[in-house]
């Protein structure tokens, strides 16, 4: 079964050494989640031809996946530590409903999907501790999330496969941008 960072012997150094610092934990968690996404993408691509599909735009119109934009202050030009951290946390909170949707979408990688979801929750907690400006972080409405989940699950098979592919791809891009940005913090 997948093991969260900090739980296996490789991540917990010998008892006499210091525990992971906040930035080490965050870095390790993001890289762990990215590894999990790679495994899930592998199953998705093997199962369907979505990874080569040119019809992504069709499905993308129905999704409102979090994306980094210039105004979020996470890119090299116009980088802003505070604004960017708020965007990363807000984006991860918005991704949670999509990660919930992924839970029933995998057969051989079911545990991996759960581990990605759980590790993302832990990552959000670490980042919230780091953030000074918590007031600026908006949490998605539970009712909105519930109706979005219902809507996504009601799609036909092709759209569900495409949605799964797009969620994984977008989440990977979001995390990669976050990782780069967090390394300047």
């Amino acid at each position: 079964a997948p093991v969260l960072p900090g739980e296996d012997s490789k991540d917990v150094a010998a008892p006499h050494s210091q525990p992971l610092t906040s930035s080490e934990r965050i870095d390790k968690h993001i890289r762990y989640i990215l590894d999990g996404i790679s495994a899930l993408r592998k199953e998705t691509c093997n199962r369907s031809n979505m990874c080569e599909s040119s019809k992504e735009a069709l499905a993308e119109n129905n999704l409102n996946l979090p994306k980094m934009a210039e105004k979020d202050g996470c890119f090299q030009s116009g980088f802003n530590e505070d604004t960017c951290l708020v965007k990363i946390i807000t984006g991860l909170l918005e991704f949670e409903v999509y990660l919930e949707y992924l839970q029933n979408r995998f057969e051989s990688s079911e545990e991996q999907a759960r581990a990605v979801q759980m590790s993302t929750k832990v990552l959000i907690q670490f980042l919230q501790k780091k953030a000074k400006n918590l007031d600026a972080i908006t949490t998605p409405e539970p009712t909105t999330n519930a109706s979005l989940l219902t809507k996504l699950q009601a799609q036909n098979q092709w759209l569900q496969d495409m949605t799964t592919h797009l969620i994984l791809r977008s989440f990977k891009e979001f995390l990669q941008s976050s990782l780069r940005a967090l390394r300047q913090m």
Partner: antibody
């Protein structure tokens, strides 16, 4: 063209203080974490301190913790190192360095350095 | 003293290949892919050659390459040229939000 120009070095007595400055130009200073690295005469390099792009997080080598303070003024594109309780072993050339974007702890641009001598 | 161990000196003839090692521990070199290498010409500031173990910095010739196995990193310079004569330093992230350098290696190009 990226430029980092250090100033403020000089001769100081043990127990004294100095404030180093580093004027940055040719890049968006506020987008980068910055650091100070020193090199004692005829010796190797030693990492001293790091500050995050917005100045929120600071990190120090054990050898300077509690004596040195790193800070930055993004409006002035300037990095600082306030050095108190100086010791003879702090004698070195102090380099202002920029962290490579999105990379964990690699320094892609260095200033020419400013000499700090601690002696009575 | 330096935390990472490098040979004080290495030498090689023009056109040949030299490798400089950088030995650390599981808390620094072995912790992640966070090793970088720097070249310092006499009287100059250091210059980034390699970062993230094996990625070349912008404008660096492909004669320079980096690698890592367990707690030891290596810099390999092939097709040695007289202008490569310099001091070379490895650096690594160290557990606890620190950075550490090696003691430096003086490269002499013979002939």
């Amino acid at each position: 063209e990226v430029q980092l120009v250090e100033s403020g070095g000089g001769l100081v007595q043990p127990g004294g203080s100095l404030r180093l400055s580093c004027a940055a130009s040719g890049f968006t200073f506020s987008s980068y974490a910055m650091s100070w690295v020193r090199q004692a005469p005829g010796k190797g390099l030693e990492w001293v301190s790091r500050i995050s792009s917005g100045g929120i997080s600071t990190y120090y080598a054990d050898s300077v913790k509690g004596r040195f303070t790193i800070s930055r003024d993004n409006a002035k594109n300037t990095l600082y190192l306030q050095m108190n309780s100086l010791k003879p072993e702090d004698t070195a050339v102090y380099y202002c360095v920029r962290y490579a974007w999105g990379v964990q702890w690699a320094f892609d641009f260095w200033g020419q350095g400013t000499q700090v001598t601690v002696s009575s | 003293q330096s935390v990472l161990t490098q040979p004080p000196s290495v030498s090689g003839s023009p056109g040949k290949t030299v490798t400089i090692s950088c030995a650390g521990t599981s808390s620094d070199v072995g912790y992640g892919n966070y090793v970088s290498w720097y070249q310092q010409l006499p009287g100059m500031a250091p210059k980034l050659l390699i970062y993230d173990v094996n990625k070349r910095a912008s404008g660096i010739a492909d004669r320079f390459s980096g690698s890592k196995f367990a707690n030891t990193a290596s810099l390999t310079i092939s097709g040695l040229q007289s202008e490569d004569e310099a001091d070379y330093y490895c650096a690594s992230y160290k557990r606890g939000d620190n950075a550490v350098f090696g003691g430096g290696t003086k490269l002499t190009v013979l002939g």
